[in-house]
């Protein structure tokens, strides 16, 4: 090996990576908010809706301060993978019923996938432990009715909104520790 010529800076610094991850998460949060408004407008639904297969909210915003970087990123990635799977399921199962939301749902899926890749890259750059993904979950059962699917859509978008809101706060807090 010859003398070190040095390399030009080829890719973003992890702190810059974290900044762009926060921006992407914020824009995804806004997409989800807009989509939730559209869904409520087109398919009004009273009260909160739950779906047993969705992840429970990772952490209250107040308890974020005690979290460590690896646990935040690992948990966030696991939860977002679950939401990605649910959005894919929703698009497949409810294609015709949610046709009016389709372009936006497709964009949401693409951006969610991009955010997951960004988180993985950030974990690689920091050399944080990347736990093996959970074993594949059993396939989600198709909704029992159109109304059941719409309730599921409300639950998925509502849960994703809360998770992304938590994610923005968590990532901003982590930035101060990097």
């Amino acid at each position: 090996p010859g003398p070190p010529p040095g390399s030009p800076r080829a890719s973003p610094d992890p702190r810059a990576e974290l900044d762009s991850t926060v921006l992407l998460t914020r824009s995804l949060l806004e997409d989800t908010r807009q989509l939730t408004i559209q869904l409520k407008d087109k398919f009004p639904a009273d009260g909160d809706h739950n779906l047993d297969s969705l992840p429970t909210l990772a952490m209250s915003a107040g308890a974020l301060g005690a979290l460590q970087l690896p646990s935040v990123l690992t948990r966030l990635r696991a939860d977002l993978l679950s939401y990605l799977r649910h959005v894919q399921w929703l698009r497949r199962a409810m294609g015709s019923s949610l046709k009016t939301l389709e372009p936006e749902l497709g964009t949401l899926q693409t951006r969610l996938d991009r955010l997951l890749r960004r988180l993985q890259l950030l974990m690689s750059r920091l050399a944080l432990p990347q736990l093996p993904p959970d074993p594949p979950a059993p396939p989600l059962a198709p909704p029992s009715s159109t109304w059941g699917g719409i309730r599921a859509a409300h639950a998925i978008l509502g849960g994703l909104h809360l998770t992304l809101d938590w994610a923005v706060r968590g990532l901003l807090l982590l930035k101060t520790r990097l």
Partner: antibody, heavy 114, light 111 residues
């Protein structure tokens, strides 16, 4: 400009020890996980060890576990690899690398031979 | 034996397009971990060519592109040039090792 400069390689007898160093400049060293990757003569790349950006996580390839120790000093922008109980099969060019790895040093040759 | 599998050699004539494949196992590529590609010119250190399956670091020509589908990934080089003659390695995080694994490398010859 990013620079990673390895040093400390050389000829050592089987069973002996060496300590490799890697001096980093041109980037925020303390924000990057750091790796050691080696390449035996005429062979492919083999990952050796990794340490997280803050030194709290360290992982090793099975082939070096219990013999090699990776460490870092963020105040000095320096990465280390302490190699004990060296074997002939550890003969290789050892590269220090940052991030994915995104950046690589030019390597230092370690020869284990009697 | 490498954890990721690449063809040992590939070749093409100037101007041609060549593709190098990389396949993995359940603890790396199959688990959804991203694939990165490195170029190692003779006598030099490896250089990052593609990261996160398809992203190009600044300074890497757009003749180089990467893709990933399910259990494998591939690197494509279009408009082949003599200076592309090098060894190419794929890498991915491996959850059983808690570190990256490399393919065995593909020696590209420009005829």
């Amino acid at each position: 400009e990013v620079q990673l400069l390895e040093s400390g390689g050389g000829l050592v007898q089987p069973g002996g020890s060496l300590r490799l160093s890697c001096a980093a400049s041109g980037f925020t060293f303390s924000s990057y996980g750091m790796h050691w990757v080696r390449q035996a003569p005429g062979k492919g790349l083999e990952w050796v060890a990794v340490i997280s950006y803050d030194g709290s996580y360290k992982y090793y390839a099975d082939s070096v576990k219990g013999r090699f120790t990776i460490s870092r000093d963020n105040s000095k922008n320096t990465l280390y690899l302490q190699m004990n109980s060296l074997r002939a099969e550890d003969t290789a060019v050892y590269y220090c690398a940052a991030g994915v790895p995104d950046y690589w040093g030019q390597g230092t040759l370690v020869t284990v031979s009697s | 034996q490498s954890v990721l599998t690449q063809p040992p050699s590939a070749s093409g004539t100037p101007g041609q397009r060549v593709t190098i494949s990389c396949s993995g196992s359940s603890s790396n590529i199959w688990s959804g971990y991203d694939v990165h590609w490195y170029q190692q010119l003779p006598g030099t250190a490896p250089k990052l060519l593609i990261y996160s399956n398809e992203e190009r670091p600044s300074g890497v020509p757009d003749r180089f592109s990467g893709s990933k589908s399910g259990t494998s990934a591939s690197l494509a080089i279009s408009g082949l040039r003599s200076e592309d003659e090098a060894d190419y390695y794929c890498a991915a995080w491996d959850s059983s090792l808690y570190g990256p694994v490399f393919g065995g490398g593909t020696k590209l010859t420009v005829l």
